[in-house]
Each structure stands twice: as structure tokens, then as C-alpha cells.
Interface confidence: medium
């Protein structure tokens, strides 16, 4: 055909017919097979979706191409011709590679290779697992610490290279007839205290624990100083009742004769139960309290000095006789409506609650536990309505600058305790910034509308008295008659009413 | 609903004595220290003393010491005040009351009255 | 003993008026101070705790104030059914001591 008789506008991949006229070449396509229309394009058929027939056979995959098409094996597989096309079904001779074979240190150390249809797995060895990160590599199981539990309880799981052992553990002997090694390997405890191997000071107990023994104070003795108690080196001193004698410079009978009564009760501490002790301290308190006679007549300030003394004696001596209290829970409660609440738990990972008639303690059991003292934790809360006649017209000492709460508006102005006063202790003594919070929930007396409610902490003076303060402690929310606060530190708290309305809050303390 | 319903209106002997019950209900017995006050006619309220139910522990105003006895009965909630040697001066009524939040007294009961006569 | 002085037996006021009862203790009872409403027949019912402290039920117009040993019971617009006898009582020590009384009657 001459070239002045083809189109020149003819698209790519097409060719002309005549000076008016294009055909799309094969494998393409166009609205219709002789076009005249300069616009018109030619689009790739594509072969290997319907209506087109093409087949290219099992373990295979058919892939388009511009114009045309190609038949491949799957990964895995390869034609027996080692030619990487074929055009049909029956040029298909794909069969499934060997990569084993192929590839010998296909899978690394402690791996078995294993050929499967199309691809290859590795296999490892008993007592060997694939590493996460690379499934080929496999790597030693530790038995001891894959959660199989391969070895009885009564014995320590010893991890080898691809396997592992059972073995007694220090303190243990395999059982008659069994052997100390293999995995059915079961021992039993060596009683150091019964058979005397132990190494226990006169001053303490043995006690055999699973495995092994410690040396635990006698009741009512203590660990000499420095000493940890609960060890096999544990040496301890008989304990003596906490002193707690009255504040110096106040002169109050009253408060004399709570004293007088409260070093009765140390004199005969050793023949009485802690419990008891325990028992009698609190109705002296609560009957003090009821009664306070003539602490009314102290000035303000002596009557802060004294209910500080009464409540870090309280802390300081029932932290004492705590320690001789056996594990369990203890409440009781006074007619003048002193509280006191304690539980005495091993080790345990869990919250405790300590519930009272106008107030609820939460926090974790690891607070109470005293570092390196693997003996029993206490928590303790103590209840003192009473208190509140000793504390009253005390100052709040606001946070950022440690300023007497005072303005121009609300001069002389002071909070109104709204709560029972309580103190919290714990085995513990350390607790003045804790790793957990502690979540008190106080009822009270009514808040007075748009007053604002604070949670506070009594916090003991330069000069041994004392006063409110908020630092550490948020009030969480508040209700009414009840109120929740937050606490990263343990003391005396309670809840006071603002002497202000919110809408004209004091700033340093918002 | 918090009640005290007191024992009804008693008429004595003078030297006799006599035994007044506050029967309790609505709030938990052993939670709460009950009071009792006299009033005599035309005068004012007097404290005579507590009972703690929960360990029977008492108090007294002194100057009722070895006139008024407290008791009570936890498995019926009663408490119950007896009045010895009774003279014409004890003619009174006489209440009991709960304990409220602190040492008021929250709740009072019906009050019994006592007459002594001859 | 901490004794506690009302100073008026009675005290006559007209309807709608404001009422003024004082109590005064014997030894600074810091605030610990409870008011109650005696009506005729019926036993006392507690009307003020803390010196300050309205109980529920009692309208508004009641209010109490004071400290150290002297305290105010007062009542604003004076209503018939006001009509009782007020008492204060001292928690601050035992033994528990109330007032004498102070009889509220309408003029």
C-alpha cells in the first residue's frame, strides 16, 4: 500500500488501513476494529481475565503483557525445560523445586530442612525453637522458663543446650529412690530445725520454710539494731513497749493521767497480748478524748502541740505492737466513736481497703512492706473524732510558699473541720513520698454550698505542734457528706470546709 | 426510719425501782452509743449517761452514779435504764437518744414518763 | 462540771419578728454546741450541731453562730409553728450539760 495512502494520525499500537482508516494491532483493542476517528486509542487486551480463553495449567500463573500474555510457574515450581514462559496448558510442565536439595544450609543450626509442594520448611530440633525474628534460625528452649513446667515442684529446672535437668533444690534431697537429674526427678524438704542442722541464735526461733529455714525474734523480742529479722543470721533483743510520754511543757492532769495509764499498760506489756495492749491504749484515748477535761484550758497553740503528740505516739506505738499481732484483720470500735482498723498479710500483690463508719483506706499492699524485711506488712487506720477538740481555730498553711492561708478579704478567717480525724500507718515507716497513691473516702458534716471542700494532712510544725496543709494530697471529688481524696504520703488527714465561697477563691490555693 | 420507741408511763412506790426499755430500730445498734436524759417538770434536760452496746461499756454523770443502771440487749436492740430508791425528785420524764455524728444527740426517743408516788 | 446559762426563760416576740436566744458556757467549749427545738408533749429535736451546723429539715430562717463560750441561736421572720422551747447543750465534756431553756412565745 503506498505511505500517501496510510493515515498519519493513526494512535500507537495500531497501524493504518488507508489515508482515512486504523486497526488496532493484535493483542490491543478499540471501540471497533477499523476506526476514522483521530481520538480513538488502542487498549492492551488483557488475556488472562474472561471472556479470553486462555489456560495456562496447575502450580502455574498467567501474567499480561503489553499486547500479549505469558504463562509462568507458581514460586516453587519451575518447567522441566528450565525456560522461564509458556504459552498454554499444554506446554506446561511445572513440577515443584527441591530448595532443600538445592540449598543445603538452607535452614541454619539446629534446623532440619523439609521440601513441601512449591516451598520448603525448616524443622527444629527437640528441645530447639524458631527465633521470632528470623524463622529459619532455631535457637535453644528454655525449658525452665517456656511456662512448661517440665520439672516437679520440689526440685530447680537446670537449662542445657537443646534439653534441661531436674534437680533438688539447696535445701532438699531426692526421695527415696528417685533420681536428681532427669525430668521425673522429685525431692523433699531437709527439716534444718527438727534434724538441728540449722544455725538459729537462742534468741529467735527456727522456723523450716520450703526448702529452707530462717530464724524469726521470739515473741515480743526485736532484731537487734542494724539486724534484719527473718534471716539465718537474725540475732534479737527483748522489745520494749514504745515510750511515748507526755509532750514537754504542757501541764494538763488529764493528759497526765491518760500517760500514767498508757506506761501501766508497757509495764505489763510482756505478759499481755499486743492485742490487748492494743485494745486498752485506744478506750484511754477514746475516754480522753471524750472527756478531755482540763486540756480546754491550754492556750489554742499547747492544745495543737498536744493532739500532735497524741497522734504521732499513736502511729509510732501501734506500728510497735503491730509487729506482734499474727496474720489477720482486726476492728475495733469505742463509744466516743474512735476507730481502728488493721491487717497484718504476708506478701501479697493486691490493694487492701480498710473500712471504718466515716472513712475507707485503699492503697497496694507493696507500700506497707518494709525493704529487705520479708516478715508479715501491716496497714493500719485509726479513727479519732475526738481529735477535733484539740484542733480547733488551726491555721491552713497553703502550698507554693508555705503561707499562712490570709488575704484581705478572708483575714483571721479560719477552716472548719469537717471530718473525723484519722491516721494511717503502716509496717512501713518510710511513707512520706510513696510510690502509690493512697485513696481516702471521708463521710462528714454537710458542706455549705459553693464552699470550697480540702483534703489536708496534719503536718507537724518546726516547733512540734502543727498545722493543715494540702501538699500531697488532691481532693479527687466531693459530695455532700462525702469526700475523696488522693494522697502520695501518710499522716493524720481529715477534710475541711474553706472559709470562703469558690466564686472568690483564695488563689493560692487553687 | 430511725426510731426509738421508749416503754410506756410508769407510777411508782417511793424506795421502789424501776426499769425503762428503748426499743431500737432503723440504724445499727452496736454503731451508736444511747444516751438517756431526765426532765424533770418545768425544768430543763440532764445527762445521765451512755451505754455502748457493742461491748456493754457505760458512763454516768456522776451525780446519777448509783441511781440509773444501763443495759443492753443486743439480739432484741433494746437498751433499758433502771432507776433505784426512787423519791418524789425522780418524778420525771426520761428519754433516750442516739449518738449523732458527734456527741448530740441525732435521734430521740418517745420519753416514758415516771411518776413517784404513794 | 461546764454549766450552760440561757439567759432568758421567755422570750415574747411578735409574728414575722426576728428572734435572738443566747447560751453561754461556763469554760470555752470550742464550738462544740448542738441546739434543739422542744415542742409541747414531744421530745427535744435537734436543731443545730457544731454551733453552726442547720439539720435538715429546718427552714433557713433558723441560724447559729458564736464561739469560745458564747453562742446564738437566732431566728429571722418568726413563724407559729416556732413556737417551742429552745435548749443548748455543750459536747465538749462530759458530763453532757444543757441550758435551762428558753420558752418562745408569740405577743
Known amino acids: 500500500q503506498d505511505s500517501r495512502d496510510c493515515a498519519r494520525w493513526c494512535p500507537e499500537n495500531s497501524s493504518c488501513v488507508n489515508a482515512t482508516a486504523c486497526r488496532c494491532n493484535p493483542g490491543f483493542s478499540s471501540s471497533s476494529e477499523i476506526f476514522t476517528s483521530p481520538t480513538e486509542i488502542c487498549d492492551d487486551i488483557n488475556e488472562c481475565v474472561p471472556p479470553s480463553k486462555v489456560s495456562c495449567g496447575k502450580s502455574s500463573d498467567c501474567r499480561n503483557t503489553e499486547g500479549s500474555y505469558d504463562c509462568v510457574c507458581n514460586p516453587g515450581y519451575e518447567l522441566v525445560s528450565g525456560a522461564k514462559t509458556f504459552k498454554n496448558e499444554s506446554e506446561n510442565t511445572c513440577q515443584d523445586v527441591d530448595e532443600c536439595q538445592q540449598n543445603p544450609r538452607l535452614c541454619k543450626s539446629y534446623g532440619t530442612c523439609v521440601n513441601t509442594l512449591g516451598s520448603f520448611t525448616c524443622q527444629c530440633l527437640p528441645g530447639f525453637k524458631f527465633k521470632p525474628e528470623d524463622p529459619k534460625l532455631c535457637t535453644d528452649v528454655n525449658e525452665c522458663t517456656s511456662g512448661q513446667n517440665p520439672c516437679h515442684s520440689s526440685t530447680h529446672c537446670l537449662n542445657n543446650v537443646g534439653s534441661y535437668q531436674c534437680r533438688c533444690r539447696p535445701g532438699w534431697q531426692p526421695i527415696p529412690g528417685s533420681p536428681n537429674g532427669p525430668n521425673n526427678t522429685v525431692c523433699e524438704d531437709v527439716d534444718e530445725c527438727s534434724s538441728g542442722l540449722h544455725q538459729c541464735d537462742s534468741s529467735t526461733i527456727c522456723f523450716n520454710t520450703v526448702g529452707l529455714y530462717t530464724c524469726r525474734c521470739r515473741p515480743g523480742w526485736e532484731p537487734k539494731h542494724g539486724i534484719p529479722n527473718n534471716q539465718k543470721d537474725t540475732v534479737c533483743k527483748d522489745m520494749h513497749f514504745p515510750t511515748w510520754t507526755p509532750p514537754p511543757g504542757v501541764h494538763s492532769q488529764t493528759l497526765s493521767q491518760f500517760f500514767n495509764k498508757v506506761q501501766d499498760l508497757g509495764r505489763d506489756f510482756k505478759t499481755r497480748s499486743a492485742k490487748v495492749t492494743i485494745q486498752s491504749i485506744l478506750k484511754e484515748l477514746d475516754e480522753l478524748l471524750e472527756a478531755p477535761g482540763d486540756l480546754e484550758t491550754l492556750p489554742r497553740f499547747q492544745q495543737h502541740c498536744v493532739a500532735t503528740h497524741l497522734l504521732d505516739g499513736l502511729e509510732d506505738v501501734f506500728r510497735g505492737l503491730s509487729k506482734n499481732l499474727s496474720i489477720g484483720l482486726l476492728n475495733f470500735s469505742y463509744p466516743a466513736g474512735t476507730e481502728f482498723s488493721l491487717e497484718v498479710q504476708k506478701q501479697v500483690d493486691r490493694n487492701v481497703t480498710l473500712r471504718q463508719n466515716q472513712a475507707t483506706m485503699q492503697l497496694h499492699w507493696n507500700l506497707a512492706q518494709k525493704s529487705g524485711d520479708p516478715g508479715p506488712s501491716v496497714v493500719g487506720l485509726v479513727s479519732v473524732p475526738g481529735m477535733g477538740k484539740l484542733l480547733a481555730e488551726v491555721p491552713l498553711v497553703s502550698e507554693p510558699e508555705n503561707q499562712v492561708v490570709r488575704n484581705e478579704t478572708h483575714q483571721g478567717l479560719l477552716p472548719i473541720l469537717l471530718s473525723d480525724i484519722i491516721s494511717a500507718f503502716l509496717s512501713n515507716n518510710d511513707t512520706q513520698n510513696l510510690s502509690s497513691p493512697v485513696t481516702f473516702t471521708f463521710s462528714h458534716r454537710s458542706v455549705i454550698p459553693r464552699q470550697k471542700v480540702l483534703c489536708v494532712f496534719w503536718e507537724h510544725g518546726q516547733n512540734g505542734c502543727g498545722h493543715w496543709a494540702t501538699t500531697g494530697c488532691s481532693t479527687m471529688g466531693t459530695r455532700d457528706t462525702s469526700t475523696i481524696c488522693r494522697c502520695t504520703h501518710l499522716s493524720s488527714f481529715a477534710v475541711l470546709m474553706a472559709p470562703y465561697d469558690v466564686q472568690e477563691e483564695d488563689p493560692v490555693l487553687t | 426510719q430511725v426510731q426509738l420507741q421508749q416503754s410506756d408511763a410508769e407510777l411508782v412506790k417511793p424506795g421502789a425501782s424501776v426499769k425503762i426499755s428503748c426499743k431500737v430500730s432503723?440504724?445499727?445498734?452496736?454503731?451508736?452509743?444511747i444516751h438517756w436524759m431526765r426532765q424533770r417538770p418545768e425544768q430543763g434536760l440532764e445527762w445521765i449517761g451512755y451505754?455502748?452496746?457493742?461491748?456493754?461499756?457505760?458512763r454516768y454523770n456522776e451525780k446519777f452514779k448509783g441511781k440509773a443502771s444501763l443495759t443492753a440487749d443486743k439480739s432484741s436492740t433494746t437498751a433499758y435504764m433502771q432507776l433505784s430508791s426512787l423519791t418524789s425528785e425522780d418524778s420525771a420524764v426520761y428519754f433516750c437518744a442516739k449518738r449523732g455524728y458527734y456527741w448530740y444527740f441525732d435521734v430521740w426517743g418517745t420519753g416514758t414518763t415516771v411518776t413517784v408516788s404513794s | 462540771d461546764i454549766q450552760m446559762t440561757q439567759a432568758s426563760s421567755y422570750l415574747s416576740v411578735s409574728l414575722g419578728g426576728r428572734v435572738t436566744i443566747t447560751c453561754k458556757a461556763s469554760?470555752?467549749?470550742?464550738?462544740?454546741l448542738a441546739w434543739y427545738q422542744q415542742k409541747p408533749g414531744n421530745a427535744p429535736r435537734l436543731l443545730i450541731s457544731h454551733a453552726t451546723n442547720l439539720e435538715t429539715g429546718f427552714p433557713s430562717r433558723f441560724s447559729g453562730s458564736g464561739s469560745g463560750k458564747d453562742y446564738t441561736l437566732s431566728i429571722t421572720s418568726l413563724q407559729t409553728e416556732d413556737v417551742a422551747t429552745y435548749y443548748c447543750q455543750q459536747y465538749w465534756n462530759i458530763p453532757y450539760t444543757f441550758g435551762g431553756g428558753t420558752k418562745l412565745e408569740i405577743e
Open positions: 451505754i455502748y452496746p457493742t461491748d456493754g461499756n457505760t
Open positions: 469554760d470555752h467549749i470550742n464550738n462544740w
Open positions: 432503723g440504724f445499727s445498734f452496736t454503731d451508736h452509743t
